[in-house]
């Protein structure tokens, strides 16, 4: 029979008839090592490779340019996949994007597009989004025309300020747009009237830090 | 490029009325809280009024409360000031200013007008 | 309203010294979001004014790493760490923690 091929994915993982989320292992074209990564079977269908949570504010997301190149944390909590490893797996069929968030009240929304990449390095991790959809606001929260990714200390944004050191974490600012997943992780009662925070416009307003939030991606012909 | 371009100064006899414009480029309009400050001949500068990006929020110091009506017409990039009944004492260089930050997050002024200069005489 | 008091009013300085402009409010200009709303601007002679620092010491894009901004709550400094002439003009210090957003009467800078 045909050797069985590597997990590229959580699409394929859940296509090999595992259906639990979890973490797996992954093996991302072009990429030296696997990864793991935590696969979430559960939402609208399963099979999301899960690039970003955020839950309880026990990891520091104010972090530089090589940190987010190569990701951070723990995939069975809060974690930042790494660019270089969204880069990878984005590159190597068309994906769609799905952001799930939560306030502090308990309401949940999610945000969903059509297409989702980003650049290489070079091109400072450029985000490409395409056909918005979901609960979490009429408008998107992301940059549709395109933004690069700026940390602490790679200020790429379209600001006369620096947005990733003002308002903290790396993120593809424009000036400093719409949203900001990777800001300041506020308890509840002191959530609101955060330039820093967790924000998502569209869905809570300009100033108000969510309680969780995931972005997952999954293939277009999953 | 960011520009924001000013029309419609000029010399004005007390009571009247003058319409100041504010055509911006070179950014997403619709984004961004906007702001007239003044400037009096050898003067400080004394902010006007501010309206929200969406038009929904308006401000006015008191100064010119009832008076002047800021206004704004995404479509166009345009920003507007209406200043109805003037005195003597609004004689000043006129100036828009655009929020640093988008999305209604203020935290000064980011980009400038040229000014525009209204003279208010008799 | 808040007032903001700059002081001096008038500052000579030599090309390559030093140069120091406090502004002071009325009341804390530490924000609930936890920022000092607290802004510098830079007029040169016949042209608009320029924003040099925002939140109270964050330097904006363009603007040469000798001009620092410091301070918390009422008081409030600007400093340049070498004065040169292309930095004549008045300096307007600006609060927009409580509204109506007001400035400073300005300092005005020139070279001796």
């Known amino acids: 029979r045909e050797e069985e091929k590597p997990f590229r994915d959580c699409a394929d993982v859940y296509q090999a008839g595992f259906n639990k989320s979890g973490i797996y292992t992954i093996y991302i074209n072009n990429m030296p090592e696997p990864k793991k990564v935590f696969c979430n079977m559960d939402v609208n269908g399963g099979g999301w490779t899960v690039i970003q949570h955020r839950e309880d504010g026990s990891l520091d997301f104010q972090r530089g340019w090589k940190e987010y190149k190569m990701g951070f944390g723990n995939p069975s909590g809060e974690y930042w996949l790494g660019n270089e490893f969204i880069f990878a797996i984005t590159s190597q069929r068309q994906y769609m994007l799905r952001i799930e968030l939560m306030d502090w009240e308990g309401n949940r929304a999610y945000s969903q597009y059509d297409r989702f990449h980003i650049g290489n390095e070079k091109q400072n991790y450029r985000l490409y989004l395409k056909g918005h959809t979901g609960t979490a606001g009429k408008q998107s929260s992301l940059i549709l025309h395109g933004a690069d990714f700026s940390t602490k200390d790679a200020d790429n944004d379209n600001c006369m300020c620096k947005c990733a050191l003002m308002l903290t974490g790396g993120w593809w600012f424009d000036a400093c747009g719409p949203s900001n997943l990777n800001g300041m992780f506020y308890t509840a009662g002191q959530n609101h009237g955060k330039l820093n925070g967790i924000k998502w416009h569209y869905f809570k307003g300009p100033s108000y830090s969510l309680r969780s939030t995931t972005m997952m991606i999954r293939p277009l012909d999953f | 490029e960011v520009q924001l371009v000013q029309s419609g100064g000029g010399v004005v006899q007390p009571g009247r009325s003058l319409r100041l414009s504010c055509a911006a480029s070179?950014?997403?309009?619709?984004?961004?809280?906007m702001h007239w400050v003044r400037q009096a001949p050898g003067k400080g500068l004394e902010w006007v009024s501010y309206i929200s990006s969406s038009g929904s929020t308006i401000y006015y110091a008191d100064s010119v409360k009832g008076r002047f009506t800021i206004s704004r017409d995404n479509a166009k990039n345009s920003l507007y000031l209406q200043m109805n009944s003037l005195r003597a004492e609004d004689t000043a260089v006129y100036y828009c200013a655009r929020d640093l930050l988008d999305y209604d997050i203020w935290t000064g002024y980011g980009y400038w007008g040229q000014g525009t200069l209204v003279t208010v005489s008799s | 309203d808040i007032v903001m008091t700059q002081s001096p009013l008038s500052l000579p300085v030599t090309p390559g010294e030093p140069a120091s402009i406090s502004c002071r409010s009325s009341q804390s200009l530490l924000h609930s979001n936890g920022y000092n709303m607290l802004d510098w601007y830079l007029q040169k002679p016949g042209q608009s004014p320029q924003l040099l620092i925002y939140l109270g010491s964050n330097r904006a894009s363009g603007v040469p790493d000798r001009f620092s901004g410091s301070g918390s709550g009422t008081d409030f400094t600007l400093k340049i760490s070498r004065v040169e002439a292309e930095d004549v003009g008045v300096y307007y210090c600006?609060?927009?923690?409580?509204?109506?957003?007001?400035f400073g009467q300005g300092t005005k800078l020139e070279i001796k």
């Open positions: 600006m609060q927009g923690t409580h509204w109506p957003p007001t």
């Open positions: 070179g950014f997403t309009f619709s984004s961004y809280g």
